[in-house]
């Protein structure tokens, strides 16, 4: 297993609709044809997998059914979008990239993106 640098933004604020997007960029030492991207969430020293996708030569990442993630890729950049976020989902979201093929296998883990989610205030009753 060889190490690889992965860069991602330090902080992202989710939209009022609970959607957060960020770019995960990896420094590929060669021409990988099969890449696996995993988003991990770290909160209270617990790490859980949010979503994962393996992609090849295309620009659309396909996630498992009912995943809260969507994504596209361009070169060594992966554009990730996480949907359905609520305030309780605030935490550090870590991008993990694996170059699966061809050998050698490379693994890179980013420092994480702190995603802040603020639940929208309910609309006040209107007199109109």
């Amino acid at each position: 297993c060889k190490a690889m640098h992965v860069a991602q933004p330090a902080v992202v604020l989710a939209s009022s609709r609970g959607i957060a997007s960020f770019v995960c960029e990896y420094a590929s030492p060669g021409k990988a044809t099969e890449v696996r991207v995993t988003v991990l969430r770290q909160a209270d020293s617990q790490v859980t997998e949010v979503c994962a996708a393996t992609y090849m030569m295309g620009n659309e990442l396909t996630f498992l059914d009912d995943s809260i993630c969507t994504g596209t890729s361009s070169g060594n950049q992966v554009n990730l979008t996480i949907q359905g976020l609520r305030a309780m989902d605030t935490g550090l979201y870590i991008c993990k990239v694996e170059l699966m093929y061809p050998p050698p296998y490379y693994l890179g883990i980013g420092n994480g993106t702190q995603i802040y989610v603020i639940d929208p205030e309910p609309c006040p009753d209107s007199d109109f």
Epitope: T33, E34, M56, M57, G58, E60, T70, T72
Partner: antibody, heavy 115, light 106 residues
Amino acid sequence: QVHLQQSGDVLVKPGASVNLSCKASGYTFTSYWINWIKQRPGQGLEWIGRIAPGSGTTYYNEMFTGKATLTVVTSSTTAYIQLSSLSFEDSAVYFCARGDYFDYWDQGTTLTVSS
Amino acid sequence: QIVLTQSPAIMSASPGGKVTITCSASKSVSYIHWFQQKPGTSPKLLIYDTSTLASGVPPRFSGSGSGPSYSLTISRMEAEDAATYYCQQRTTYPLTFGGGTKLEVR
């Protein structure tokens, strides 16, 4: 030029298993998914699953779990689908298609399950 | 799984006429892709990533849409366009196709 060539049409009895092949040429085999698609007579397209030829990574449509098994032999740039415990409902045309974009398809293999 | 509903299921158009086929997803998808299939042949990639024409596809074909609603348009129908058209999503597994729209020439 890119070409996908499947095995010939097959007639089998219920309960049997069958292996269909998809021989790829004209591109780097390990750089693209191989997808398998089923089409029953007069019906639409159903995605069975896909395999990454380099690593062997597979994804299946749950509807075909236990029915279909995808494999590859990279040395011969050939992908295979094994269909087991065949029933009449498995009678269909089976296609293989290349990559994320399904940009090249083979001509299809007709599988007929009949007693 | 994401269900793609195509409409209409069957339609006819006169040569030179405009044709629009819609594809509605049960959940928002990143892109929709379109295939054309003529009887006895394998499907052919027509449009990918919602609006990009595949190599060799005539410019009378176009695709558009976002979120859950997409469409395929033929600006001027030609006899050779008679076929069944399928939309497809690759946002989540399992990959799914629409039920198809059979387009006949009037």
